[in-house]
Interface confidence: medium
């Protein structure tokens, strides 16, 4: 889940937490981040990054415990870090990335946190103990569980699924403002001696905020915006307002270099090296910055500032945000990128504007014809119609364009000649006194998936050729084999003759040459990402998923692929989870991806699996997965015993009881059974997956998974008074597959 520096999730906790098993995996480039808060009126648990170090604060009743990671290990390095905090039986343990970092005794009281859990930030919670805590997380929580339950569900609309690209974007990646409420906040812009703000702006917004920095005194600010398509800067300093306009239009969708320079004497805005500045009147004295530098949009406070201002900076403009992008951002000479932002709203990594406009406007017309060439290509918006000047020869009467374009058809991965029929003149060249060699083509934008190869000396570098070259088959398109069924070339066509003709032909006309790619069906293949050997424990089952084998087919989606298991169907060890006992001789790629299939070992030597996969037209060559069944080995990992007061109950946790097996990449079922009668109490298991308030009942068997989930306990039921500590010897046996380890 992605948190953008001002977001959080809340999770209710209705009852006190006796044990805590908290696991977080996060990544951030910010040295400050609030990761998690479990909040009560006084009791609380806080995990935060501060100066790149992880700090844990646990307050239970009157007691306070603090743990932190070493100063030399900074966790604000954009790399995912795994944090595990356990509080069990009066002992707190913190580990990061598998290394024990700190542990300490804690009071045995439960943690009373009725206000709930706050993930990534504290929202509007205003509790005294939250003063001085870190900023909300700007980064990713890849996982967050408390006592085995996810804390990241359900996501709210402003916390996004997955880990956003912008958190790993380097300084050379543009800030994309995708609107309508986009905003990026950076550390304050200090202008004590002088301040500079530089970026390359691409936008079509005629009215939009660009930069806002509030001052320490109420009402002071620096504000730069686009006003009626031009740059404007306003500096409000105490009693005086300085207002500056620049005359270079910027709302044209083209990149413009913008520089804002301010010092005690003057303010200067420069667009594409064209400067506008105030006279050296010294109005500006130093503006003490307060809060963040806001780019591309305004928060509520900044909007209020501007709406209250006597210049009447219009409400529409203050509520809108920039639609466009800023590249090469630098603040006081220091490069800044999305990674350095303190918070972002509705941002994208990179500047996609030009490309999208181009794709949508120019390419969209041809989508319908991506697989079959139409009888007649629809009227194109390119080239712009040419209006011939008066007094030209009659051949140019009703002339609008030089060429009629037809799509070039090429096989996937193949080649096709550019021929006369693709670029046919609309008029008789001889009558117009034009030669084919005078009709000059230049490639202004190449195809995405192929190359126009010119068999003419020097032409390949210049990307220029003539209509005569086309007739002589000197230009051919070579497709790169990718799967898209349509592409295009942008050609500029001009005429070099010195005869009377419309001036648009001298200047050149732009044409789109659509390229239609006829797909070729590639057969699928089976690949084994971790090698073609699978190890399974005897008499157990192991999931078969894409981590074991998968299909690779460049031109078929998973939905269109079917696997077959070759060989006799009787005794076939592949089954669907929900149809135990029924061999699965055929299954879909979707089923494989969904984890619906298992390999079941029922004894004897394991059966190898030979598969093939088909896309409905072609099948892959058979591929064999070698399967080896090994006898389960069970080893006691922990068996510590418990101490508890008579009449009380105590959970049995992995720290008290756990076993290890020799399973390789296999989550095996480990069953514990009580083999002897108990004298002083009973073993109990909790229903409903560990929900507080769920019933406990006596049990003679439980799984290791139950222990891991805190669902097993020993209850002392002995009513007699003893002058000594009684000892209950709990005799257990462990079973994995058909292997049993007794007298545990």
């Amino acid at each position: 889940a992605s948190f953008f520096g001002e977001n959080h999730l809340e999770v209710p906790v209705a009852t006190a937490l006796t044990d805590i098993d908290l696991q977080l995996q996060f990544s951030t480039s910010q040295p400050e981040a609030l990761l998690l808060l479990a909040a009560g009126p006084a009791d609380h648990l806080l995990l935060q990054l501060y100066s790149g170090r992880l700090q844990v604060r646990l307050v239970l009743g009157q007691e306070e415990l603090r743990l932190q990671t070493p100063a030399e290990t900074l966790l604000s390095d954009s790399i995912p870090h795994t944090v595990v905090l356990t509080v069990v039986e009066g002992w707190a343990t913190l580990s990061v990335d598998g290394f024990l970092n700190a542990s300490s005794a804690v009071p045995g009281a439960p943690l009373e946190v009725p206000y709930g859990l706050f993930v990534g930030g504290t929202g509007t919670l205003g509790l005294p103990y939250l003063r001085g805590t870190s900023r909300p997380l700007r980064g990713c929580l890849h996982a967050a569980t408390l006592n085995g339950r996810s804390l990241l569900r359900p996501l709210t609309p402003d916390v996004h699924e997955g880990c956003a690209e912008e958190f790993s974007a380097s300084d050379d990646v543009a800030l994309g403002f995708s609107g309508p409420h986009s905003l990026a906040a950076f550390p304050a812009w200090g202008t004590q001696d002088e301040g500079t703000l530089e970026f390359t702006l691409t936008t079509q917004s005629r009215q939009a905020p660009l930069a806002f920095q509030a001052g320490g005194r109420r009402g002071d600010f620096i504000y730069v915006d686009i006003f009626e398509g031009h740059l404007r800067a306003v500096v409000e300093k105490g009693q005086g307002t300085v207002l500056l306009h620049n005359s270079v239009p910027v709302a044209d969708g083209q990149p413009h270099e913008v520089s804002v320079h301010i010092n005690a004497h003057r303010l200067e805005i420069s667009v594409d090296q064209y400067p506008t500045h105030t006279s050296n009147r010294g109005v500006l004295s130093y503006l003490e910055p307060r809060g963040s530098l806001l780019l591309g949009g305004l928060d509520a406070e900044a909007s209020r500032h501007l709406q209250e201002h006597r210049l009447g900076l219009t409400p529409e403009a203050t509520n809108a945000s920039l639609l466009g992008c800023m590249e090469d951002l630098s603040v006081n000479g220091q490069r800044r990128g999305l990674r350095e932002a303190l918070l972002t709203r509705n941002m994208a990594a990179g500047c996609r504007l030009e490309e999208e406009e181009y794709e949508d406007d120019a390419y969209g017309h041809y989508e319908a014809f991506s697989t079959l060439a139409p009888e007649a290509w629809p009227a194109m918006e390119l080239p712009e119609p040419c209006v011939p000047e008066p007094g030209l020869p009659p051949v140019f009467a009703n002339f609008t364009q030089l060429l009629t374009i037809s799509p070039l058809v090429v096989a996937e991965g193949g080649t096709a000649w550019l021929e006369w029929r693709h670029v046919q003149p609309t008029l008789d060249l001889m009558e117009a006194e034009l030669r084919k060699s005078q009709v000059l083509f230049s490639v202004t934008r190449g195809a995405r998936h192929g190359e126009l190869e010119l068999d003419i000396p020097g032409a390949q570098a210049r990307k220029m050729f003539t209509l005569l070259d086309v007739v002589n088959r000197k230009a051919r398109f070579i497709h790169d084999g990718s799967e898209d069924t349509s592409d295009q070339l942008v050609l500029e066509v001009s005429v070099t003759a010195r005869v009377p003709m419309p001036s648009c032909l001298r200047r050149g006309q732009t044409y789109l040459l659509p390229i239609q790619v006829n797909p070729v069906n590639d057969p699928p293949h089976i690949i084994f990402p971790h090698g073609s050997l699978m190890v399974i424990l005897e008499h157990t089952q192991k999931p078969l998923g894409p981590e074991v084998f998968q299909a690779y087919d460049p031109d078929s989606a998973c939905e269109g692929l079917t696997f077959q298991v070759l060989g006799t169907s009787s005794g076939l060890p592949v089954e669907r989870r929900d149809q135990p006992g029924e061999p699965a001789t055929e299954f879909s790629c979707r089923e494989l991806e969904a984890g619906s299939l298992v390999y079941v070992h029922r004894g004897g030597p394991a059966q190898d699996l030979t598969f093939r996969v088909s896309d409905g037209l072609q099948a892959s060559p058979p591929a064999t997965l070698k399967v080896v069944a090994i006898r389960p080995a069970i080893q006691i990992h922990r068996s510590t015993g418990l101490r508890l007061a008579q009449g009380s109950a105590m959970p049995i946790l992995p720290a008290n009881l756990s076993v290890e097996t020799n399973a390789v990449g296999q989550d095996v079922s480990v069953l514990f059974r009580v083999t002897g009668a108990l004298q002083f109490g009973e073993l109990q298991k909790q229903g409903a997956g560990g929900v507080e308030g769920a019933e406990w009942w006596a049990t003679q068997a439980f799984h290791q998974r139950d222990v891991e989930q805190g669902r097993v306990r020993y209850l002392s039921t002995d009513p007699q008074h003893h002058a000594y500590d009684t000892v209950e010897n709990l005799a257990l046996e462990v079973q994995v597959g058909q292997e049993i380890l007794s007298n545990l």
Epitope: E10, P12, P154
Partner: antibody, heavy 122, light 107 residues
């Protein structure tokens, strides 16, 4: 014994208003997030609103279909949750249930009121 | 919004039958799915949560499985009191949504 006792409901004309109440007993009301879920033959079960705790600033979430028309609220001192409905439409007809969840296991509804019928018709 | 599609909508079965109801989500919801049982004139009651965990007091004949987009509720041996309508619900993201329901009737 947990109990969610609902009141309100009845017949109302399109464009009219109505307030539903839900009184809770058997658990610490102030620790539980409260919700309203409605049921109609046309749309089946439909979650419509959620209100969180005082400590969560009484955060509210609504289904798109009722946003701006329905307001969920709570009074912890009375262990009560409310649903104020204005500008009612025919499609708001159905049985309205008050529900709760209070466990970090997940946002599923572990306690339900008996339901109250709202009919919007002229 | 995440759509939940339950199948079948109606199901006729006899006492003792094994019954399976499926719930398909329009996008990945991990295991954040709950199942409810509703009898005529009554409010729904929780059966399972987190796709496979039984709620307190729910008989062991009810079980659930699945993760991602496909979930199943299985009643291993149908009892007379199990004839009712069953609903799935996702709590992976807002708005919380329910399936259309499966009515289990006596054959």
């Amino acid at each position: 014994q947990v109990k969610l006792q609902q009141s309100g409901g009845g017949l109302v004309q399109p464009g009219g208003s109505m307030k539903l109440s839900c009184v809770v007993s058997g658990f610490t009301f102030s620790n539980y997030w409260m919700n309203w879920v409605r049921q109609s033959p046309e749309k089946g079960l439909e979650w419509i609103a959620e209100i969180r705790l005082k400590s969560n600033n009484f955060g509210r979430y609504y289904a798109e279909s009722v946003k701006g028309r329905f307001t969920i609220s709570r009074d912890d001192s009375k262990s009560s949750a409310y649903l104020q409905m204005i500008n009612l439409r025919a499609e708001d007809t159905g049985i309205y249930y008050c529900t709760s969840y209070g466990n970090y296991v997940g946002h599923y509804f572990d306690h339900w009121g008996q339901g109250t019928t709202v009919t919007v018709s002229s | 919004d995440i759509q939940l599609t339950q199948s079948p909508s109606f199901l006729s079965a006899s006492v003792g039958d094994r019954v399976t109801i499926t719930c398909k989500a329009s996008q990945n919801v991990d295991t954040n799915v709950a199942w409810y049982q509703q009898k005529p004139g009554k409010a729904p009651e929780p059966l399972l949560f987190s796709a496979s965990y039984r709620y307190t007091g729910v008989p062991s004949r009810f079980s659930g499985s699945g993760s991602g987009t496909e979930f199943t509720l299985t009643i291993s041996s149908l009892q007379p009191e199990d004839f009712a309508t069953y609903y799935c619900q996702q709590y992976n993201s807002y708005p919380l949504t329910f399936g259309g329901g499966t009515k289990v009737e006596i054959k």
